[in-house]
Interface confidence: low
């Protein structure tokens, strides 16, 4: 059940990023650290960089509330997995500040790309029975 809960939360994050991409014009056009081509075993570290980034609503128009709620949900901690627990202790991963900074559109695209990667890794780790909840 923990596996499924993790999968549903990760899936929701993908959907939220997809939905926020439709509102990039309502986000503060600030440059944010956006990990790309993340090396294996540093996915959770990069994920936390995306979560820590100060993505903000520009406070314009009717979309402000839904954007703020969505950003909050992006920062919600997904259920822990063995892979996540293992990676939390890696000190060799790049710091958040070392990643290239990008505007919200590219930031969200890279976040989505990382989520997709983590998603597929999670599925394949289940298939090969190497991870439990």
């Amino acid at each position: 059940q923990g596996q499924d809960r993790h999968m549903i939360r990760m899936r929701q994050l993908i959907d939220i990023v997809d939905q926020l991409k439709n509102y990039v014009n309502d986000l503060v056009p600030e440059f944010l650290p956006a990990p790309e081509d993340v090396e294996t075993n540093c996915e959770w570290s990069a994920f936390s960089c995306f979560q820590k980034a100060q993505l903000k609503s520009a406070n314009t128009g009717n979309n402000e509330r839904i954007i703020n709620v969505s950003i909050k949900k992006l920062k919600r901690k997904p259920p822990s997995t063995n892979a996540g627990r293992r990676q939390k202790h890696r000190l060799t991963c790049p710091s958040c500040d070392s990643y290239e900074k990008k505007p919200p559109k590219e930031f969200l695209e890279r976040f989505k790309s990382l989520l997709d990667k983590m998603d597929h890794q999670h599925l394949s780790s289940r298939t090969h029975g190497s991870e439990d909840s």
């Epitope: 059940q1 499924d4 809960r5 999968m7 549903i8 899936r11 929701q12 994050l13 993908i14 959907d15 939220i16 997809d18 939905q19 991409k21 439709n22 839904i66 709620v69 969505s70 949900k73 992006l74 919600r76 997709d116 998603d119 597929h120």
Partner: antibody, heavy 120, light 107 residues
Framework: EVQLVESGGGLVKPGGSLRLSCAAS????????MNWVRQAPGKGLEWVSS????????HYADSVKGRFTISRDNAKNSLYLQMNSLRAEDTAVYYC?????????????WGQGTTVTVSS | AIQLTQSPSSLSASVGDRVTITCRAS??????LAWYQQKPGKAPKILIH???SLESGVPSRFSGSGSGTDFTLTISSLQPEDFATYYC?????????FGQGTKLEIK
């Protein structure tokens, strides 16, 4: 107006096939997970299958696994359910349903349903 | 699969009554639950998402509460249009499952 319109239901013999379609309008279809839910005559609701916005996750109820295939075409704002090896117990109204999105739990937009009858 | 058990299965009440329907999950589902209303010949309509959040456009007489395994849907003062069947649904794990339904009838 946010709308889902199902089509493709009908009468089919046991062992036969049908393809249900759902046309979405009034919202950004490519950003939402979609589901099929069915209801047999006089019975409760049964979740059948779900597919995420980019088709990354696909899940089925055990009762239809291996026989039904869910798919979507985001360019056409359409959701599909290919139903093979149909059985009498698949007789139901099939609803196309949008998952609420934005990280919320719920299904907030339902089509009017299309009726599938499996009978010899 | 997670089982949802609704009680009662049917209920007779009068306009103005306060009504409570419960939904019990076979395991912890956090707040991953929604409530729906369905009238004969119509598609279901969402009332509550995330166990306790009222869906936009739904009258405030409807409310949801609970977390973990025990959930309730409350209608504070029944209106004639509230006589229908109510379902809970969990989103904690696949397969998504529904409760068996509670039919609310006029006394």
């Amino acid at each position: 107006e946010v709308q889902l319109v199902e089509s493709g239901g009908g009468l089919v013999k046991p062992g036969g096939s049908l393809r249900l379609s759902c046309a979405a309008s009034g919202f950004i279809f490519s950003s939402y997970s979609m589901n099929w839910v069915r209801q047999a005559p006089g019975k409760g609701l049964e979740w059948v299958s779900s597919i995420t916005s980019g088709s990354y996750y696909i899940h089925y109820a055990d009762s239809v696994k291996g026989r039904f295939t869910i798919s979507r075409d985001n360019a056409k704002n359409s959701l599909y359910l290919q139903m093979n090896s149909l059985r009498a117990e698949d007789t139901a109204v099939y609803y196309c349903v949008r998952e609420r999105g934005w990280g919320y739990y719920g299904m907030d937009v339902w089509g009017q349903g299309t009726t599938v009858t499996v009978s010899s | 699969a997670i089982q949802l058990t609704q009680s009662p299965s049917s209920l007779s009440a009068s306009v103005g009554d306060r009504v409570t329907i419960t939904c019990r999950a076979s395991q912890d589902i956090d707040s991953a639950l929604a409530w729906y209303q369905q009238k004969p010949g119509k598609a279901p309509k969402i009332l509550i998402h995330d166990a306790s959040s009222l869906e936009s456009g739904v009258p405030s007489r409807f409310s949801g509460s609970g977390s973990g395994t025990d959930f309730t849907l409350t209608i504070s003062s029944l209106q004639p249009e509230d006589f229908a069947t109510y379902y809970c649904q969990q989103f904690n794990s696949y397969p998504y499952t529904f409760g068996q339904g509670t039919k609310l009838e006029i006394k």
